[in-house]
């Protein structure tokens, strides 16, 4: 698993990056776990990074990801007093120069090394869900979310609002 120090070195001063022509609103480090409290971990294997969903041993440190928050350039349909309709998007980076990517063809979630500007596949619309959980919807494929399948992350199509509560697309973010 990546050491936290590597990620902390990577944490940048606010506004010094330009992704899709915009800067992040803010960035911070958090650990990512599933609804069932399994940890999302990252490991270097055969010169590529793998993503695992696993139970950690008692004193094992959780991997951290750098969450970068962006406002969408396109508003949602919601309107009314005070709301401007823009949605909150995130990118997730567990180590320098690597970001989670949605591979819509393979229905997979992968870690890709890339330069800025990041491709749209690295952006996810943030959803609030029940039990203080969040979900991550692909910017490139609305209705498709990051989810857990066979102890790996995968892309899961959600075809109705009732299915939005399915446990395998629910995640917890912890800044501690």
């Amino acid at each position: 698993a990546f050491g936290i120090s590597g990620v902390q070195k990577y944490t940048r001063a606010l506004h010094d990056s330009s992704i899709t022509g915009i800067s992040p609103i803010t960035e911070y480090l958090a650990s990512l776990s599933t609804y069932n409290d399994q940890s999302i971990t990252f490991a270097l294997e055969d010169e590529s990074y793998e993503i695992y969903v696993e139970d950690l041993k008692k004193d094992e440190k959780k991997d951290k990801v750098l969450l970068s928050y962006y406002e969408s350039q396109h508003p949602s349909n919601e309107s009314g007093d005070g709301v401007d309709g823009k949605m909150l998007m995130v990118t997730l980076s567990p180590t320098k120069d690597f970001w989670l990517h949605a591979n819509n063809k393979e229905h997979s979630v992968e870690l890709h090394k890339c330069e800025k500007p990041l491709p749209d596949q690295a952006f996810f619309v943030l959803h609030n869900m029940h039990s203080n959980c969040v979900s991550f919807e692909c910017k490139t494929d609305p209705g498709v979310f990051i989810g857990v399948k066979d102890n790996h992350l995968a892309l899961i199509k959600v075809d109705s609002s009732e299915n939005l509560c399915t446990e395998n697309i629910l995640f917890k973010l912890s800044e501690t």
Epitope: I25, T26, Y28, A30, Y69, E71, S76, E78, G82, V83, D84, G85, K86, M87, L88, V125, L126, H127, N128, M129, H130, N132, V134, E137, L164, L173, S174, E175, T176
Partner: nanobody, 119 residues
Framework: QLQLVESGGGLVQPGGSLRLSCAAS????????MGWYRQAPGKQRELVAV???????NYGDSVKGRFTMSRDNAKNTVYLQMNSLKSEDTAVYYC?????????????WGQGTQVTVSS
């Protein structure tokens, strides 16, 4: 829907202090990001401070060490303590929340409160 109401603005001398408040009311109870922005006449709106759901706070370069953002979860209120104010801090200050109960996280703005730093 969500209403954000700012208060605490006014006229203050250079070197003085002000405390801004922003109270959120309405049906939204989960906020992912809370922040303060400001806009001076003829300038773009700029980030002053932003706080995450877990309490991590980042500040704009021009206010670091002088401004402090805090919150009171029980009152759904955020604060901006502004010390050592300078004339260049004169602006309309806006409260900014990102939140939702269920579904995509959306952005909300307050109406703004005027801060004037002048002798």
């Amino acid at each position: 829907q969500l209403q954000l109401v700012e208060s605490g603005g006014g006229l203050v001398q250079p070197g003085g202090s002000l405390r801004l408040s922003c109270a959120a009311s309405g049906s939204i109870f989960r906020f992912n990001l809370m922040g303060w922005y400001r806009q001076a006449p003829g300038k773009q709106r700029e980030l002053v401070a932003v706080m995450s759901e877990g309490g991590t706070t980042n500040y704009g370069d021009s206010v670091k060490g002088r401004f402090t953002m805090s919150r009171d979860n029980a009152k759904n209120t955020v604060y901006l303590q502004m010390n050592s104010l300078k004339s260049e801090d004169t602006a309309v200050y806006y409260c900014n929340f990102w939140g939702s109960n269920s579904g995509p996280v959306l952005q909300y703005w307050g109406q703004g409160t005027q801060v004037t730093v002048s002798s």
